[in-house]
C-alpha cells in the first residue's frame, strides 16, 4: 500500500507511517515502528505537557517567586502549568502574572478614575477634551486646561490630552 501523506487526529507522520501522539502529561520516548506502538513516559514531578504531543522533554512548572510578590494560586499537574497570583493587596502586571505591583499608574493622557484598593487595581480614564495629564500617576486625575480668558490672555498654543494650553498676551491694535 501507498505510504500515507497525512495522518488522523492525535497522530503524526514519521518515516512514512502514522504514529500515535503522546497524551497530555506524557512525553515521547520512541517513535512507533511497523511493529511497535509509540512509547511514552509520564512527566516527572514539577513537569507538565498540556497537549497531545511528540515532545521529548516535558516543560517545567512555572515558579511563583515570593521575592516578586507571587504565590501559587493553583498547583500544576502533569497536564497543567502552575498558576501564580499576587500576594493580597498586590496586582499582576500581566495575564500571565509574572510579577506584581502595588498598583499600576495611568500614563500621560490618562487620569485616575479610581485609586487602587486591596482588591482592584487603579482604574484609568482618557482625559476628555478640555483636560490633560502630563504625568504617569496612580492618584492624579486629569487637570482642566488653563482658562486664558480669565487671565485676560489668549490661547497661543492649543492644549492636548497630554499638555496644557499655552496662554499669551493679546495683540494690541496700533493706533
Amino acid at each position: 500500500p501507498e505510504p500515507p501523506t497525512a495522518c488522523r487526529e492525535k497522530q503524526y507522520l514519521i518515516n512514512s507511517q502514522c504514529c500515535s501522539l503522546c497524551q497530555p502529561g506524557q512525553k515521547l520516548v520512541s517513535d512507533c515502528t511497523e511493529f511497535t506502538e509509540t512509547e511514552c513516559l509520564p512527566c516527572g514531578e514539577s513537569e507538565f505537557l498540556d497537549t497531545w504531543n511528540r515532545e521529548t522533554h516535558c516543560h517545567q512548572h512555572k515558579y511563583c517567586d515570593p521575592n516578586l510578590g507571587l504565590r501559587v494560586q493553583q498547583k500544576g499537574t502533569s497536564e497543567t502549568d502552575t498558576i501564580c497570583t499576587c500576594e493580597e493587596g498586590w496586582h499582576c502586571t500581566s495575564e500571565a502574572c509574572e510579577s506584581c505591583v502595588l498598583h499600576r499608574s495611568c500614563s500621560p493622557g490618562f487620569g485616575v478614575k479610581q485609586i487602587a484598593t486591596g482588591v482592584s487595581d487603579t482604574i484609568c480614564e482618557p482625559c476628555p477634551v478640555g483636560f490633560f495629564s502630563n504625568v504617569s500617576s496612580a492618584f492624579e486625575k486629569c487637570h482642566p486646561w488653563t482658562s486664558c480668558e480669565t487671565k485676560d490672555l489668549v490661547v497661543q498654543q492649543a492644549g492636548t490630552n497630554k499638555t496644557d494650553v499655552v496662554c499669551g498676551p493679546q495683540d494690541r491694535l496700533r493706533a
Partner: nanobody, 116 residues
C-alpha cells in the same frame, strides 16, 4: 540597586504625633511619585498618602485626612509623613513605595504602635 528605608516608627499614646522618614538610594529621587502604604496586624494593605513627582499634588485616604501630611525633600532623597492626632487604628507597619511600585521596590517598613 533601588533601596527604600523607612524609619521613625515607635510606640506613641493616642493623640500623639510621629514623623516617619523614607530614605531612598540607588536612583534619582526627584520626579518620582511616592506613596505611604500601611498594613495593620492581620489586615490588607491600605494606601495612606501619595505625593506627585513635582510635590505639587498630594493624596490622602479619608481615614487620615486632616491628620497626616506628606512631604518630600529631593535634596535629601527623603520622603516624610507627619502623623498627628494618632489613633489606635493607625497602628500598622508603614511602608514607602515608588513608581513602578513593583514588589522589589519595597522597604522593610517601620512599625507604628498607638496605645495607652
Amino acid at each position: 540597586e533601588v533601596q527604600l528605608l523607612e524609619s521613625g516608627g515607635g510606640l506613641v499614646q493616642p493623640g500623639g504625633s510621629l514623623r516617619l522618614s523614607c530614605a531612598a538610594s540607588g536612583f534619582t529621587f526627584a520626579g518620582y511619585e511616592l506613596w505611604w502604604v500601611r498594613q495593620a496586624p492581620g489586615k490588607g494593605l491600605e494606601r495612606v498618602s501619595a505625593i506627585s513627582g513635582s510635590g505639587g499634588s498630594t493624596y490622602y485616604a479619608d481615614s487620615v485626612k486632616g491628620r497626616f501630611t506628606i512631604s518630600r525633600d529631593d535634596s535629601k532623597n527623603t520622603l516624610y509623613l507627619q502623623m498627628n492626632s494618632l489613633r489606635a487604628e493607625d497602628t500598622a507597619v508603614y511602608y514607602c513605595a515608588r513608581d513602578p511600585y513593583s514588589f522589589d521596590y519595597w522597604g522593610q517598613g517601620t512599625l507604628v504602635t498607638v496605645s495607652s
